[in-house]
Amino acid sequence: TQHGIRLPLRSGLGGAPLGLRLPRETDEEPEEPGRRGSFVEMVDNLRGKSGQGYYVEMTVGSPPQTLNILVDTGSSNFAVGAAPHPFLHRYYQRQLSSTYRDLRKGVYVPYTQGKWEGELGTDLVSIPHGPNVTVRANIAAITESDKFFINGSNWEGILGLAYAEIARPDDSLEPFFDSLVKQTHVPNLFSLQLCGAGFPLNQSEVLASVGGSMIIGGIDHSLYTGSLWYTPIRREWYYEVIIVRVEINGQDLKMDCKEYNYDKSIVDSGTTNLRLPKKVFEAAVKSIKAASSTEKFPDGFWLGEQLVCWQAGTTPWNIFPVISLYLMGEVTNQSFRITILPQQYLRPVEDVATSQDDCYKFAISQSSTGTVMGAVIMEGFYVVFDRARKRIGFAVSACHVHDEFRTAAVEGPFVTLDMEDCGYNIPQTDESTLMT
């Protein structure tokens, strides 16, 4: 499979926290009552790791059927395995649910590689380690799939958290989060803390690993340090944002900022890599190569194909540069930057060399569909999807992997002019609505 492609991504199993929690640097007052504070029941409710996706436990139907569901901010369907499949431990059995309602409508979702198809219906859904509510939600019962479910993974479905505009078969199919907000008092906001391991996990370690937190309806102070900085959601389809500048070790890539957002830039928990438009990718890799030139690596490494290994504990993090993305701020002519470390963009891979090795794949890749800020970016930060205020917030994650010399950062403000010009306007044609 391609690296950094869209779902499905393999997931790990479950257990105790990865990485230590850092103390809060600031303790600002809540902006709105009930929107911030402690959400103890939701902390550590995700499992998995960056190369394999992150999943949450959900229940579907009456009596409740428990399933592990991949959290995906890059799609908008709630879809679950609903027929036997060699790679599934369990699946949704509609005939056993007294509350299932058939919508008598099919759905077909093709990916670049693979696809799933199924039958639409509704049923009662809840999240055991989430808000104490049950909602009636649309469910795509997957009856056939190809290269979607993954052997040895521990998830049976996907929770698309983006907007109705990109739901299949069309935008009339209300996404799960919209249903949740409409039917309950849960605020129209969720936040994600994805915790990358920073080191390869063997099967026994994965069983005892934690993936992070999905806080539904709020923001948990314990999950981040410093301040939250917000960037506007440009358009409510994907979680689209605008990147206004890119730096490698503080050196500006000096490209027309439209290139960074060609044809869009999105925040997507269902993609492994930081994916960049072709021109941007080439410029970024050239700059990263130059910064790390004391060591040379084969082309296959920079293509995300070959692994590079070092003797355990000797990975030369210091030779790899930090990468900063400047995002449009909430105030006119103001931006802020998020900075990731090689500990985020070099993805640990297990089971390829000996236990005396630490092996990594380069987790920045080329895209033909714009910038995708996948797990590689999100693992550095606590990310707030503030749908109510049409904005996305970033703060340094309390669980991000770093070393004694450098840490991920969210910093601002910076003066940046003409940021609106950085957005790319996708041509609208009559045919575009017909494309899958």
């Epitope: 060591e295 040379k296 690596f297 296959g300 194909e305 070959q306 692994l307 290994c309 390829v352 060399a353």
Partner: antibody, heavy 120, light 108 residues
């Protein structure tokens, strides 16, 4: 054309340090296009990778050699060297130096090899 | 650890015959695989890289194929100088470290 030639003692006593040098002729060891490496082959057996070095001094070693190996480079002499400490009879082998080309991936040029016997 | 298994261990053939050598990886190595030829008393020589590309100066009778876990080196018509030991090596995990155990092609 570029050639590689190994040199060093053919006999080393157990527990001592094996030292070999590879001289590069017909080209520069400071080329940014190559790593340089050592591979060994015990008599009648297969090939075992020992380690690589870049002209900048960046090194990679086989973890199975458990810290006994050191590879260094001397760009002024167009040479790179191998030191293997605490040798035993199991380290008896033909030692080859080689160039890692084709985008740092493949050993595309080899020295003739030198037999090193570990014996008292 | 990725293990490369070569088969058969020995292949007994006559000049002019076709030789088919196999190299199987314990997990996918994509197309990052090389084949080497080694004659007695000589250093190995690179024949094929990236699974199917002939190295400089290698005759067209040598060809490589495969990707993922299964690879084949084919010598279309054996010449007397082709009787040697052949090794495969993966470089999916870098730096290149793992060699197969070798296949000896001997005169029948």
């Amino acid at each position: 054309q570029l050639q590689l030639q190994e040199s060093g003692p053919g006999l080393v006593k157990p527990s001592e340090t094996l030292s070999l040098t590879c001289t590069v002729s017909g080209g520069s060891i400071s080329s940014s296009s190559y790593y340089w490496g050592w591979i060994r082959q015990p008599p009648g057996k297969g090939l075992e990778w020992i380690g690589n070095i870049y002209y900048s001094g960046s090194t990679y070693y086989n973890p199975s050699l458990k810290g006994r190996v050191t590879i260094s480079v001397d760009t002024s002499k167009n040479q790179f060297s191998l030191k293997l400490s605490s040798v035993t009879a199991a380290d008896t082998a033909v030692y080859y130096c080689a160039r890692l080309g084709h985008g740092y991936n493949y050993f595309d040029l080899w020295g003739r090899g030198t037999l090193v016997t570990v014996s008292s | 650890e990725i293990v490369l298994t070569q088969s058969p261990a020995t292949l007994s053939l006559s000049p002019g015959e076709r030789a088919t050598l196999s190299c199987r990886a314990s997990q996918s190595v994509s197309s990052y695989l090389a084949w080497f030829q080694q004659k007695p008393g000589q250093a190995p020589r690179l024949l094929i890289y990236d699974a199917s590309n002939r190295a400089t100066g290698i005759p067209a009778r040598f060809s490589g194929s495969g990707s993922g876990t299964d690879f084949t080196l084919t010598i279309s018509s054996l010449e007397p100088e082709d009787f040697a030991v052949y090794y495969c090596q993966q470089v999916y995990v870098w730096p290149p470290r793992t060699f197969g155990g070798g296949t000896k092609v001997e005169i029948k």
